[in-house]
Amino acid sequence: VPRWRQQWSGPGTTKRFPETVLARCVKYTEIHPEMRHVDCQSVWDAFKGAFISKHPCNITEEDYQPLMKLGTQTVPCNKILLWSRIKDLAHQFTQVQRDMFTLEDTLLGYLADDLTWCGEFNTSKINYQSCPDWRKDCSNNPVSVFWKTVSRRFAEAACDVVHVMLNGSRSKIFDKNSTFGSVEVHNLQPEKVQTLEAWVIHGGREDSRDLCQDPTIKELESIISKRNIQFSCKNIYRPDKFLQCVKNPEDSSCTSEI
C-alpha cells in the first residue's frame, strides 16, 4: 500500500535537484577564483539539512544559517543591483557590467535560481510531486524562506549607492509584497547606504511618461526617506538601447536620454 503523501498546490522539487545544485556549485567555484576554497559537497549537505525531514510549512531562517555560513561571500558593497519583477534584464545588465552584482551573481543565489525544492516531515525523501505554494499553502516553505534569508543578508551587506531595477510595465511598479518591497528595502542599513537609485524600465517603445512620478514610486521614496536613506529615480525609456550603451558607452547615440 503506497504511503499517503501530502499534496501541495505548487510544483514539486525540480528534477535532479541534488545533482543540479552540486553541478552549479562546482561550476561557480571554477569560474570565481575567490570561491575556489568552497567544498561543494559540504554546501550540498548544508542545503539538504535546511529542509530534509522538516515539515515544508515550518521552515525558518535558522534552518538556512549553516548554508549561509558556508556560502559567505564578499561582494563589493557599493556595486549591488537589486531588482523586482524584471530579473532577466537585471541579469543581462550584470553580464555586461561585470563589476555589478545581483543576488543571483553570488554563489547562493546562483545555486537556487529558478529551482524549487521541499522535503517531507520525518522522512529523508525529497518531494518531487508537489511543494507548498506561497499563497495557497504557506509562506514558511523551503523556497520562500531561502530567498527571504539570502535577500536579507544581501541587502544588509549593501553600502553607498544601491541600485534597483523596477518593471515599469507592471500595475504596481513598486510592490510592497515583493521580495524587494518586503525584505530588501527594510534591511538596507542607513548607516552604510547613502542613496537608493531606482531605474524604472519602460515596456512600450512610445512610452514617454515619467514613471518616476508613479504613486507606487512615491510610496517607495517615502519608505526609503523615513529610513534616512536618500532616493533618486531614473526612467529607462529604451531598455534595448540601455543595454547596448552599457556594452558600448562611447557610441554617439548614447549621449541622449535612454
Partner: antibody, heavy 119, light 107 residues
C-alpha cells in the same frame, strides 16, 4: 557511550606553542561539525574555533585568529587545536564540543584540559 | 564583550519557578541553545533549537524565544539546579557566541 576526551594542556611560557587533542568515540565523528570552547578562571564560556565535518572549512574567534589552527583527522576520530604565540589571556580550560546538526547546540562536551600561559 | 546579554545572577527557593533571560540582535535569525554548568564540571546541553530538550533533561526545564530575546524557565526548583546557566546562538557572522552566564542560587 558518546564521549570526548581532551589532552595536551600544560603550563607554557608567553610566546610558546601547544597542541591540544580531543579523541571522540561513540558517534560518527566524520558527520559532525566540532568546536573548541574555552573558559578563563572565574569567567564565562568563550567560543574559540569551529571546523566543518569534512575539515574543509574553519572559523575562528577574532581573539585567536592567525595564532590558533583547528584541524581534524576523521580516520583517527581526533580533533586538534594548534596554539601558537600564546598570551597570558589564553589561560583557560579548553573544551572540545560536538555540534548537533550544525547550529542546534553543542550536545557533547569533553571534560576539558587546562592551559596556563605564564612566565 | 558578548553580544548576548544575561543577568549575572538569579535566585529562587526550592519549588519555585525561576526565569533566566538572554537578549541580543542575533537571536532573531538564529537558534538559541542553553547550557548548565555545575561547579567544577563541563557544560551540559539543556535546550537546543530554541526550545527542544535532549533526552534525559527533566521537563522542569523549558525555554522560549521571541524576537531578539530568549528565556529559560526552571519550575519546581531543586537544590541541585544551583549552577551557572549560559545561552548561546550564532552571531551575525554566523559564529558561535555565548551569553555572559547567569549564576543561579537556590536559597
Amino acid at each position: 557511550e558518546v564521549q570526548l576526551l581532551e589532552s595536551g594542556g600544560d603550563l607554557v611560557q608567553p610566546g610558546g606553542s601547544l597542541r591540544l587533542s580531543c579523541g571522540a568515540s561513540g558517534f560518527t565523528f566524520s558527520d559532525h561539525y566540532m568546536s573548541w570552547v574555552r573558559q578563563a578562571p572565574g569567567k564565562g564560556l568563550e567560543w574559540v574555533a569551529d571546523i566543518s565535518a569534512r575539515g574543509s572549512n574553519t572559523w575562528y574567534a577574532d581573539s585567536v585568529k592567525g595564532r590558533f589552527t583547528i584541524s581534524r583527522d576523521n580516520s583517527e576520530n581526533t580533533l586538534y587545536l594548534q596554539m601558537n604565540s600564546l598570551r597570558a589571556e589564553d589561560t583557560a580550560v579548553y573544551y572540545c564540543a560536538k555540534n548537533w546538526n550544525y547550529n542546534y547546540g553543542m550536545d557533547v562536551w569533553g571534560h576539558g584540559t587546562t592551559v596556563t600561559v605564564s612566565s | 564583550q558578548s553580544v548576548l546579554t544575561q543577568a549575572p545572577s538569579a535566585s529562587g527557593t526550592p519549588g519555585q519557578r525561576v526565569t533566566i533571560s538572554c537578549s541580543g540582535s542575533s537571536i532573531q535569525n538564529n537558534y538559541v541553545s542553553w547550557y548548565q554548568q555545575l561547579p567544577g564540571t563541563a557544560p551540559k546541553l539543556l535546550i537546543y533549537r530554541n526550545f527542544e530538550r535532549p533526552s534525559g533533561v527533566p521537563d522542569r526545564f523549558s525555554a522560549s524565544k521571541s524576537g531578539t530575546s530568549a528565556s529559560l524557565a526552571i519550575s519546581g526548583l531543586q537544590s541541585e539546579d544551583e549552577a551557572d546557566y549560559y545561552c548561546a546562538s550564532w552571531d551575525d557572522s554566523l559564529n558561535w557566541v555565548f551569553g555572559g552566564g547567569t549564576k543561579l542560587t537556590v536559597l
